[in-house]
């Protein structure tokens, strides 16, 4: 749809790419919801956080996550249009000292408590897939995205450009 000849084309260098510095260039708070407007919520259970995908009641407050944007070290000019910008990676933190992590072995998305510098599993390449939606691709596993499966977040392999706009890997960011 966007002249993509496969996900790998844009992220093949992810395994080798490092983050410029240890400080994000930009941070802000936003709530995260699915393409179908279900909210991503976080609950403390038995001293660990669980992540849920659920419909909120009308006046129920949405959980916010801190989105931190980091520049990759090398310009990502694979697109062929002479773009000289640096690829952006994000980390997502719903509460202090906890970050979303990709567990590639279990194909799951988990909240881990950790100190900076954050591990590679906490970084996701940001994509604009579809109108006002974004997607999050694992830095540690190109072609694998955060997605929704059985009312939970999971890691979903996307193996062709046609599947890039599949609804279960599309998310909306909202500041309200």
């Amino acid at each position: 749809a966007f002249g993509i000849s496969g996900v790998q084309k844009y992220t093949r260098a992810l395994h080798d790419s490092s983050i410029t510095g240890i400080s994000p260039i930009t941070e802000y708070l936003a709530s995260l919801s699915t393409y179908n407007d279900q909210s991503i919520t976080f609950a403390l259970e038995d001293e660990s956080y669980e992540i849920y995908v659920e419909d909120l009641k009308k006046d129920e407050k949405k959980d916010k996550v801190l989105l931190s944007y980091y520049e990759s070290q090398h310009p990502s000019n694979e697109s062929g249009d002479g773009v000289d910008g640096k690829m952006l990676m994000v980390t997502l933190s719903p509460t202090k000292d906890f970050w979303l992590h990709a567990n590639n072995k279990e194909h799951s998305v988990e909240l881990h408590k950790c100190e900076k510098p954050l591990p590679d599993q906490a970084f996701f390449v940001l994509h604009n897939m579809h109108s006002n939606c974004v997607s999050f691709e694992c830095k540690t596993d190109p072609g694998v995205f955060i997605g929704v499966k059985d009312n939970h977040l999971a890691l979903i392999k996307v193996d062709s450009s046609e599947n890039l706009c599949t609804e279960n890997i599309l998310f909306k960011l909202s500041e309200t």
Partner: nanobody
Framework: QVQLVESGGGLVQPGGSLRLSCAAS????????MGWHRQAPGKQRELVAV???????NYADSVKGRFTISRDDTKNTVYLQMNSLRAEDTAVYYC???????????????WGQGTLVTVSS
């Protein structure tokens, strides 16, 4: 190619005001956020303010209540209204945007060349 062009910098007295503008152009498909950073001589570049596509904003503590960021989505332009300027606001102000192009879904970070703001009597 994506270009960011800043304007509006200059010399202003303490307590004065300036309005910076930054226009993004090129093969832009979606802009996620636009913001301003600054770099004073001998210091690291720091975030001043950012405004997201949804209208959310974030400000550095040092400029809260004095600076206001806004954007015009129709023109892919961001503005920084700077009031009650102080000597310590003297810096080169850089526009930064996160955007994707028509040829790639990957969101990239783009920077302008910078505009100098000098606050001095």
């Amino acid at each position: 190619q994506v270009q960011l062009v800043e304007s509006g910098g200059g010399l202003v007295q303490p307590g004065g005001s300036l309005r910076l503008s930054c226009a993004a152009s090129g093969s832009i498909r979606t802009v996620n956020y636009m913001g301003w950073h600054r770099q004073a001589p001998g210091k690291q570049r720091e975030l001043v303010a950012v405004v997201t596509s949804g209208g959310g904003t974030n400000y550095a503590d040092s400029v809260k209540g004095r600076f206001t960021i806004s954007r015009d989505d129709t023109k892919n332009t961001v503005y920084l209204q700077m009031n009650s300027l102080r000597a310590e606001d003297t810096a080169v102000y850089y526009c930064n945007a996160a955007a994707s192009t028509y040829s790639s879904t990957v969101v990239r970070s783009f920077w302008g060349q910078g505009t100098l703001v000098t606050v001095s009597s």
